[in-house]
Interface confidence: low
Amino acid sequence: YDFTNCDFEKIKAAYLSTISKDLITYMSGTKSTEFNNTVSCSNRPHCLTEIQSLTFNPTAGCASLAKEMFAMKTKAALAIWCPGYSETQINATQAMKKARKSKVTTNKCLEQVSQLQGLWRRFNRPLLKQQGSSDYKDDDDKHHHHHH
C-alpha cells in the first residue's frame, strides 16, 4: 500500500491522543534504555510503511501484536485516514487471524514495540528541523540510532 495520500495530521492526532498511551502501557515496566533503535524511516509514508509492517506482520518470536489495543487503534486510524487502505487489508486479515493464538508479551515483542515507538516519534517530526537553522534538534535522530 502507498501511504502517500494519507491525512498525516489526522493520523498524528490519533497517535498523540491514544496510540502513544497504549504503547507506553504495553511497555510499562521496561527500562527506556533497554532497546536500541534499529529500524527507522525517512519520511511520513515510509514511516507508516514500517509501522504497518512491525505492527501487523507476525515475526519470529512475536506473533501477537495485531490484537493489542495500540494495533487495533493504528489499524482504525489507517483505515479512516488512508484512502483505499481498508481494501488492501482484506487478504491480510486471514494471516492476522492465524496469529491470534495466545496473548504472550515476549521480550521480542517488547523490543518490537520499542522500535514502533521510535518510528512513531519519527513520524511526528519527520525532518526535525529548527526554524532558521539547518541543524537538527536531536542529531542522533538524524542518524537513526538513538536510545529511548
Epitope: 502507498d2 495520500n5 511520513r44 515510509h46
Partner: antibody, heavy 121, light 105 residues
Framework: EVQLVQSGAEVKKPGASVKVSCKAS????????MNWVRQAPGQRLEWMGI????????SYNQKFKGRVTLTVDKSASTAYMELSSLRSEDTAVYYC??????????????WGQGTTVTVSS | EIVLTQSPATLSLSPGERATLSCRAS?????MHWYQQKPGQAPRPWIY???NLASGVPARFSGSGSGTDYTLTISRLEPEDFAVYYC????????FGGGTKVEIK
C-alpha cells in the same frame, strides 16, 4: 543553499515524449519529496505528481496517469519527469519543486527555474 | 480530488488598501499553503500551513482559516505585493487553486 536546476527548453512534435531533469543540490536528496507542477500560458499551477527519492515511491495526478513517469537517479541527485503522447495542450512551463516538512505541513519550499516545453507540429 | 476555488479571480486595489483573498476547498483539509508568483518567475512559498509566514515575508501578510475556508490577508498593500497568489492543499494528494491576481487599480 538548496538549488534545483532544470534542463533546458524543449520543442516537441505531437505524439512524441519529453524528459525533463531536475538536479538537486544543497540538501540530502533522499530526505525530501520531489513534486512536478506545470503551468500552461496564462493558466493556473497544475500538480502532476510526486516521488520519494528515498524509495522511488510515486503518486500521480489521475489526469496524467499513464502518460507521466517520475524517476530519480539517487547517485546524481537528479529527478526526472517524462511525459509521453504529447499534445498541443501540454505546452507549458514544467517545474520541479522540493517538498519539505515544516510548520506541521508538507510544502513546496524550493522550486526549479522551470523548463518550457512547446508542443507544435 | 479536492478542488480549491479562489476568489476573486482578480482584485484591483491601490497601494495602502487592505486585500482579502479567499480559498475554498471542496472538502475539509488540514492546512492550506499559499504561494506568490510574479510574471516570468517560479512560485515562491508565502504562507505555510495556514498561518505561518515563509522566510522574508513581511508581517503585513497573514493567513487564517480551517476546514474548507481559508483566507490570505494583506493589511496594507505595498507596490511589491502586486502578484498572483495560489493556495495549495496536501491533505489528499496536492492541488492548487486557480489563483487570485492582485493588480494595481
Amino acid at each position: 543553499e538548496v538549488q534545483l536546476v532544470q534542463s533546458g527548453a524543449e520543442v516537441k512534435k505531437p505524439g512524441a515524449s519529453v524528459k525533463v531533469s531536475c538536479k538537486a543540490s544543497g540538501y540530502t536528496f533522499t530526505d525530501d519529496y520531489m513534486n512536478w507542477v506545470r503551468q500552461a500560458p496564462g493558466q493556473r499551477l497544475e500538480w502532476m505528481g510526486i516521488i520519494s527519492p528515498y524509495n522511488g515511491g510515486t503518486s500521480y495526478n489521475q489526469k496524467f496517469k499513464g502518460r507521466v513517469t517520475l524517476t530519480v537517479d539517487k547517485s546524481a541527485s537528479t529527478a526526472y519527469m517524462e511525459l509521453s503522447s504529447l499534445r498541443s495542450e501540454d505546452t507549458a512551463v514544467y517545474y520541479c519543486a522540493r517538498e519539505d516538512y515544516d510548520y506541521d505541513g508538507y510544502a513546496m519550499d524550493h522550486w526549479g527555474q522551470g523548463t518550457t516545453v512547446t508542443v507544435s507540429s | 480530488e479536492i478542488v480549491l476555488t479562489q476568489s476573486p479571480a482578480t482584485l484591483s486595489l491601490s497601494p495602502g488598501e487592505r486585500a482579502t483573498l479567499s480559498c475554498r476547498a471542496s472538502s475539509s483539509v488540514s492546512y492550506m499553503h499559499w504561494y506568490q508568483q510574479k510574471p516570468g518567475q517560479a512560485p515562491r512559498p508565502w504562507i505555510y500551513a495556514t498561518s505561518n509566514l515563509a522566510s522574508g515575508v513581511p508581517a503585513r501578510f497573514s493567513g487564517s482559516g480551517s476546514g474548507t475556508d481559508y483566507t490570505l490577508t494583506i493589511s496594507r498593500l505595498e507596490p511589491e505585493d502586486f502578484a498572483v497568489y495560489y493556495c495549495q492543499q496536501w491533505s489528499s494528494n496536492r492541488t492548487f487553486g486557480g489563483g487570485t491576481k492582485v493588480e494595481i487599480k
